[in-house]
């Protein structure tokens, strides 16, 4: 049993090293990176500029292309739930320093948890997405 777990860990490690998770990171960031000004109006100008792109028009072809490539990568972890979780944790770790707001962090986590499902894959049952290194803020 221990031997099998050790081999399983090694297999997961090599899978993670082979995988290119960037498309997943790009897809998720595009998904949550709506116009941040919708979180709070710029005090410099009272009204929304009519020429400003809509906060919700951010999903274009680029994002669906990233999603497709992301799902292809996540597919490699379909038969190993623990390894799927590690892949998700790696994505969270790689992007955590980009998220300088609690709402953004929570939104990213939510989207990340839904990612396997979006790809038609089984989501890991228990997967802690807290980032230990760098000391993320927690309440």
């Amino acid at each position: 049993r221990q031997q099998w777990e050790l081999q399983g860990d090694r297999r997961c490690q090599s899978q993670l090293e082979r995988a290119n998770l960037r498309p997943c990171e790009q897809h998720l960031m595009q998904k949550i990176q709506r116009d941040e000004d919708s979180y709070g109006r710029d005090p410099y100008s009272p009204s929304q500029d009519p020429y400003s792109p809509s906060p919700y028009d951010r999903r274009g072809a680029g994002s669906s292309q990233h999603q497709e490539r992301c799902c292809n990568e996540l597919n490699e972890f379909e038969n190993n739930q623990r390894c799927m979780c590690e892949a998700l944790q790696q994505i969270m770790e790689n992007q955590s320093d980009r998220l300088q707001g609690r709402q953004q962090e929570q939104q990213f986590k939510r989207e990340l948890r839904n990612l396997p499902q979006q790809c038609g894959l089984r989501a890991p049952q228990r997967c802690d997405l807290e980032v230990e290194s760098g000391g993320r803020d927690r309440y």
């Epitope: 960031m29 709070g40 710029d42 790689n94 709402q103």
Partner: antibody, heavy 118, light 110 residues
């Protein structure tokens, strides 16, 4: 409406200390990273320091590391900058700014002037 | 990361276009695909105001005559038709590794 009001500036001697405050209103203060940026008279902008929403992560420019300390009190919606061992080159208008949530400086205060001179 | 702006002084005739360059000492593209480069405008005696974020996204309330472009190490802020209210200093800022500003470009109207 988002408002950031800096206070605590003034005249201080070289080697002295000062504490700046930034009172925030109009948004959920404890949801955002906050920054201090300064501008010496007639010069450009210089990013000084930032603190994450819960205060766990603190970032400093090399020019102030070890001398300045950033902190926040989320129960009072207030950001602080504790400045020690002040030098003449620290003379500047100090602005408090709120992060957009994606590492961009979205809202700025009006600034408070710190003068270091003997 | 060091940001170098050019020109440092930019005299422009009203209604004419203007362009400011910002060059970074290293690429500002994060692995998530975004360029962490913002542009700010500071009018005399006022606080800075954000114009552009993520290299090309126009901030809310900013007139469409302002546009940002570029990727990696070379970025440009363009004003299609300069207005009297556009005078002041323009700064680029990187947010890839902590935060740093360019030295500023002073725009004056002829």
């Amino acid at each position: 409406e988002v408002q950031l009001v800096e206070t605590g500036g003034g005249l201080v001697q070289p080697g002295g200390s000062l504490r700046l405050s930034c009172a925030a209103s109009g948004f959920a203060f404890n949801d955002y990273t906050m920054h201090w940026v300064r501008q010496a008279p007639g010069k450009g902008l210089e990013w000084v320091s930032a603190i994450s929403y819960g205060g766990t992560n603190k970032y400093y420019a090399d020019s102030v590391k070890g001398r300045f300390t950033i902190s926040r009190d989320n129960s009072k919606d207030t950001l602080y900058l504790h400045m020690n061992s002040l030098r003449a080159e620290d003379t500047a208008v100090y602005y408090c700014a709120r992060d957009s949530g994606y590492r961009s400086l979205l809202h700025w205060g009006q600034g408070t002037l710190v003068t270091v001179s003997s | 990361i060091v940001l170098t702006q050019s020109p440092l002084s930019l005299p422009v005739t009203l209604g004419q276009p203007a362009s400011i360059s910002c060059r970074s000492s290293q690429s500002l593209v994060h692995r998530n695909g975004y360029n962490y480069l913002d542009w700010f405008h500071q009018r005399p005696g006022q606080s800075p105001r954000r114009l552009i974020y993520m290299a090309s996204k126009r901030a809310s309330g900013v007139p469409d005559r302002f546009s940002g472009s570029g990727s990696g190490t070379d970025f440009t802020l363009k004003i299609s038709r300069v207005d009297a209210e556009d005078v002041g200093v323009y700064y680029c800022m990187q947010a890839l590794q902590t935060w740093t500003f360019g030295q500023g470009t002073k725009l004056t109207v002829l």
